[in-house]
Interface confidence: medium
């Protein structure tokens, strides 16, 4: 039975040209995390594999940095980066857990962090 929950940074906002850290945390399970995928809609941004390390998709190499931890740093943000981001935890033996983050990239300096929320 899958007992774990994913805690994410929830709904967040950031300024155009700035950077933002996407973070997820898997808790309430002893399952082994074997890979974390970071995806934007249907596009793969990056993966962190337990044995093979990080891989950043070639199309995002200039603007995506691995970490901190299993998180992902997006740089040189544009308004087009607004949207849903997903952390997909592949675990053994539980299977797959998915967390959702919504990022809004703002033109002005009114960006503020939203509240955290959980996805079971």
């Amino acid at each position: 039975m899958m007992t774990g929950t994913i805690e994410t940074t929830g709904n967040i906002s950031a300024e155009k040209g700035g950077s933002i850290i996407l973070q997820c945390h898997l808790s309430s399970t002893t399952a082994q995390v074997t890979q974390v995928n970071w995806e934007q809609q249907d596009q793969l941004l990056a993966i962190c594999n337990a044995d093979l390390g990080w891989h950043i998709s070639p199309s995002f190499k200039d603007r995506v940095a691995p970490g901190p931890g299993l998180g992902l740093t997006l740089q040189s943000l544009t308004v087009n980066d607004t949207g849903e981001y997903f952390c997909i935890y592949h675990t053994y033996p539980d299977g797959t857990y998915t967390g959702r983050i919504f990022l809004e990239v703002l033109e002005s300096s009114v960006a503020e962090h939203g509240a955290r929320f959980q996805i079971p």
């Epitope: 074997t34 890979q35 995928n37 993966i47 594999n49 337990a50 044995d51 093979l52 891989h55 053994y92």
Partner: antibody, heavy 126, light 112 residues
């Protein structure tokens, strides 16, 4: 450090079944995208891919040998096992196992058969 | 099956001179994800094969930069800018676009 080592009989009689074990360290077959492949090389000849087994228990076989091959894994022992039935003298070869990351699962090739075992030589003769 | 054809099959080279090996596939190795699944391996005498180059032109970890790979689609080339004695062995190209993964016949590089 990733290492793999093949073990099995040195001599097999025709029609018998060959069982080879690949014992590995430095990676896990619980890890998403990873697998172990088996490759063989008859004396003085080219390499021939035989089979792969993946972290999710998916199996791929060379169609030319599919009805003779079975691949399995014991994740807790960090082992992959290849069995080959109805052995023939033409199956005399050095058999290798190697680590592999599944193509198209985002990996660009740097982990495709990137570390090999030392190989084990199997002779089929009566 | 995808057939991999290498040439030449034998390549005598003087140390310090360049060397070139050709590999042709019977089908394009370009995947829809933009990656070309072509690797080169070197099997030194009495040893297991070792990964030299992946995805046409990327050097595997620890491989000297005198090795280089080029090509696209169905035609690929492995080059050694200056051959050294330690480069002797059999070179194989391999496709892993689809099962069964297939190797070329091998090119034996020897020192003149």
């Amino acid at each position: 450090q990733v290492t793999l080592k093949e073990s099995g009989p040195v001599l097999v009689k025709p029609t018998e079944t060959l069982t080879l074990t690949c014992t590995f360290s430095g990676f896990s077959l619980r890890t998403y995208g990873l697998g172990v492949g088996w490759i063989r090389q008859p004396p003085g000849k080219a390499l021939e891919w035989l089979a792969n087994i993946w972290w999710d228990d998916d199996e791929y076989y060379n169609p030319s040998l599919k009805n003779r091959l079975t691949i399995s894994k014991d994740t807790s022992k960090s082992q992959a096992v290849l069995t080959m039935t109805n052995m023939d003298p033409v199956d005399t070869a050095t058999y290798y196992c190697a680590r592999i990351a599944r193509p198209h699962y985002y990996w660009d090739g740097r982990y495709i058969l990137d570390v090999w075992g030392q190989g084990t030589t199997v002779t089929v003769s009566s | 099956d995808i057939v991999m054809t290498q040439s030449p099959l034998s390549l005598p080279v003087t140390p310090g001179e360049p060397a070139s090996i050709s590999c042709r596939s019977s089908k394009s190795l370009l995947h829809s994800n933009g990656i070309t699944y072509l690797s080169w391996y070197l099997q030194k005498p009495g040893q297991s094969p070792q990964l030299l180059i992946y995805q046409i032109s990327n050097l595997a970890s620890g491989v000297p930069d005198r090795f280089s790979g080029s090509g696209s689609g169905t035609d690929f080339t492995l080059k050694i800018s200056r051959v050294e004695a330690e480069d002797v062995g059999v070179y194989y190209c391999m496709q892993f676009l689809e099962v069964p993964y297939t190797f070329g016949q091998g090119t034996k590089l020897e020192i003149k």
